[in-house]
Interface confidence: medium
């Protein structure tokens, strides 16, 4: 056993060396180690094959060091590794795309607070067993296409506290099991209408504290299981272009935050959800540095980047747009998806309402958190709700013009790569 470490065999073969002032990965770690705890030291570099002898390793904690470099082959041979915690290494900044290759059993990967500025191509390739991916509190500015494509079992993705300015079409492709997506406290100004296409099992979506002034309801349509949605602290523009989102929120059977309007001035601070349909009139004039919501054909956009507003005919320029009645959104399913429809990432079987950690269910629209976390798992997700259908575009009956609201065929199909401020 290395000098600064404590080694023991029960309940698992463990080499524990936390907060010992180590400046390098110690030599002489027992080859039989199943768990290695090296957190809280001064380790700056993980050389190639540092743990190659530890074929039975399942848990490796290297968090809270001063890692600046991890060799691409640092974790070679760790085919049984299940948990890897590299968090709180702010000098790391980048990770070689090959670093995690071969970790086919990895189910939890902590890369939060690592100063990461980008996710290299193929960084998460082959991590088919991954269930929890912590990427929060980094300096990520973009979500490259297909970054998470191989993560078909991922249930929790934490991306909050970064500098992400847009959510492109292919950012979340392949995440068919995703239960929780935390994107709050970023700079997101644009969500592509198809960005969430694969997220049919998503139950929790946090987009609060971003730079959104609109959100295409087409993006929300695939979220059949969505139960918790937070959209507060964004510069929402509550004019005719917000009608589809307003209609969607009226029909949403889960729990959602307030959606406070920024524009027009007369509605500033009011909750979009609590407005009447006829409050959402005309076009708000931008007075602030609003960012593109999506990029489309130039003729379908205003300089703001918002979708083009409902415009009266040339002969009727002086008139104020009258709100049309929102088109029927179809019959949103009343019942919930059965609890087992979106199984917990830990494979412990279906979740039921009675599994609530708090034990009681205060209201039918507010299902509780689910509870039991088997050993080795991460905290739980939420029960699911029934699917909802996207509302249609509102038409101004007495003119030929109609709303451009970012739905299919309305000029809202670009990828949108605008920068946040």
């Amino acid at each position: 056993c290395p000098g600064a470490c404590v080694c023991y065999n029960e309940p698992k073969v463990t080499t524990s060396c936390p907060q010992q002032g180590l400046q390098a990965v110690p030599v002489g770690i027992p080859a039989a180690s199943q768990r290695i705890f090296l957190h809280g030291n001064r380790i700056s570099h993980v050389p190639a094959a540092s743990f190659r002898a530890c074929r039975n390793l399942t848990i490796l904690w290297l968090h809270s060091n001063v890692l600046a470099r991890i060799d691409a082959a640092a974790f070679t041979g760790l085919a049984l590794l299940e948990q890897l915690d590299l968090s709180d290494n702010a000098q790391l900044r980048s990770v070689d795309p090959a670093t995690f290759h071969g970790l086919g059993r990895l189910h939890t990967l902590h890369l939060d607070r690592c100063g990461l500025q980008e996710l290299g191509p193929g960084l998460f390739r082959g991590l088919a067993a991954l269930q929890y991916l912590y990427l929060q509190d980094n300096a990520l500015q973009a979500l490259p296409d297909d970054t998470f494509r191989d993560l078909g079992n991922l249930t929790h993705l934490f991306l909050h506290g970064n500098r992400i300015s847009s959510v492109p079409e292919r950012a979340f492709r392949g995440l068919h099991s995703l239960d929780r997506l935390l994107l709050h406290q970023n700079r997101v100004a644009h969500v592509h209408p198809h960005a969430f296409r694969d997220l049919g099992r998503l139950m929790t979506l946090y987009l609060f504290a971003n730079n959104l002034s609109a959100l295409p309801t087409e993006a929300l349509a695939p979220l059949r299981a969505l139960q918790y949605l937070r959209l507060n602290d964004n510069p929402w523009v509550c004019d005719c272009r917000a009608r589809p989102l307003w209609a969607w929120l009226q029909k949403f059977r889960g729990s959602s935050s307030e959606v406070p309007c920024s524009l027009p001035q007369r509605l500033a601070g009011r909750d979009l959800k609590r407005l009447a349909a006829n409050d959402l009139q005309g076009c708000a004039v931008a007075t602030g540095p609003y960012h593109p919501i999506w990029t489309g054909r130039a003729t379908d956009e205003e300089p703001l980047g918002l979708p083009k507003c409902c415009q009266p005919d040339a002969a009727d320029k002086a008139s104020v747009l009258e709100p049309g009645r929102p088109a029927s959104a179809g019959n949103a399913l009343k019942g919930r998806v059965p609890p087992g429809d979106s199984p917990p990432g830990n494979g412990s079987g279906p979740r039921h309402i009675n599994d609530s950690p708090f034990g009681t269910l205060p209201g039918s629209a507010e299902p509780p958190l689910t509870a039991v976390r088997p050993e080795g798992s991460e905290p739980p997700g939420f029960p699911t709700s029934g699917p909802r259908r996207r509302p249609g575009c509102s038409r101004k009956n007495r003119t030929r013009s109609h709303c451009r609201l970012g739905q299919a065929g309305s000029g809202g199909g670009g990828t949108g790569d605008s920068e946040g401020s």
């Epitope: 918790y228 708090f358 958190l369 509870a371």
Partner: antibody, heavy 124, light 107 residues
């Protein structure tokens, strides 16, 4: 500066009711689950009740279930504990505590801020 | 409910000593364990979260380790101000449960 200021404790007879309040400041109350923890004289800590950020999930220890009700008013940054059918064994110092919970952070951080405590004495 | 068993129930040690407190869960709780320090007449103070993460402002002589069912709080080089009662708390599922406490006294 972060503060959790409690009130509402005192002496009450068995079978009667009390309502505890916890008014917070210095942080975004909306983002946190909140809890009540109590400590009987000379004893250890006991979790009493918890409520999620949006009141969507609420729970109680078996010892108080059916008698105590936790609630919150996010517009007033306030947490409440309504205690009915009080018993002698409910005598304790009651603390409110902030839980920087997993729903917001991705980590469970524990109860990182506590109120000053308020003494509830149940006696005839 | 998950039972948390702390040992020892009390310990007396000298300034500069290393003190170890253990906490055992009745079932596996992954890393979801917190440690608190409480001094007489005061509210508890969070020391360690998620088994091994030091809360901001807590001296480096405190450290936590463990996973699953067995956890340890270590105070390296005990200081006079460390005289207090220490509690573990499982946060794996509700109801959250505390250990019965370990009283640390300075000889």
């Amino acid at each position: 500066q972060m503060q959790l200021v409690q009130s509402g404790g005192g002496l009450e007879q068995p079978g009667r009711s009390l309502r505890l309040s916890c008014v917070t400041s210095g942080f975004n109350f909306n983002d946190y689950a909140m809890h009540w923890v109590r400590q009987a004289p000379g004893k250890g800590l006991e979790w009493v009740s918890g409520i999620s950020w949006n009141s969507g999930a609420i729970g109680y220890a078996d010892s108080v279930k059916g008698r105590f009700t936790v609630s919150r008013d996010n517009s007033k940054n306030s947490l409440y504990l309504q205690m009915n059918s009080l018993r002698a064994e409910d005598t304790a110092v009651y603390y409110c505590a902030r839980d920087y919970n997993y729903e917001i952070s991705g980590y469970y951080y524990g109860f990182d801020n506590w109120g000053q405590g308020t003494l509830v004495t149940v006696s005839s | 409910d998950i039972q948390m068993t702390q040992s020892p129930s009390s310990v007396s040690a000298s300034v500069g000593d290393r003190v170890t407190i253990t906490c055992r869960a009745s079932q596996g709780i992954s890393r979801w364990l917190s440690w608190y320090q409480q001094k007489p007449g005061k509210a508890p103070k969070l020391l360690i979260y998620a088994a091994s993460n030091l809360q901001s402002g807590v001296p480096l002589r405190f450290s936590g380790s463990g996973f699953g069912t067995d956890f340890t709080l270590t105070i390296n080089s005990l200081q006079p101000e460390d005289s207090a009662t220490y509690y573990c708390q499982q946060t794996n599922n509700f109801p959250y449960t505390f250990g019965q406490g370990t009283k640390v006294e300075i000889k």
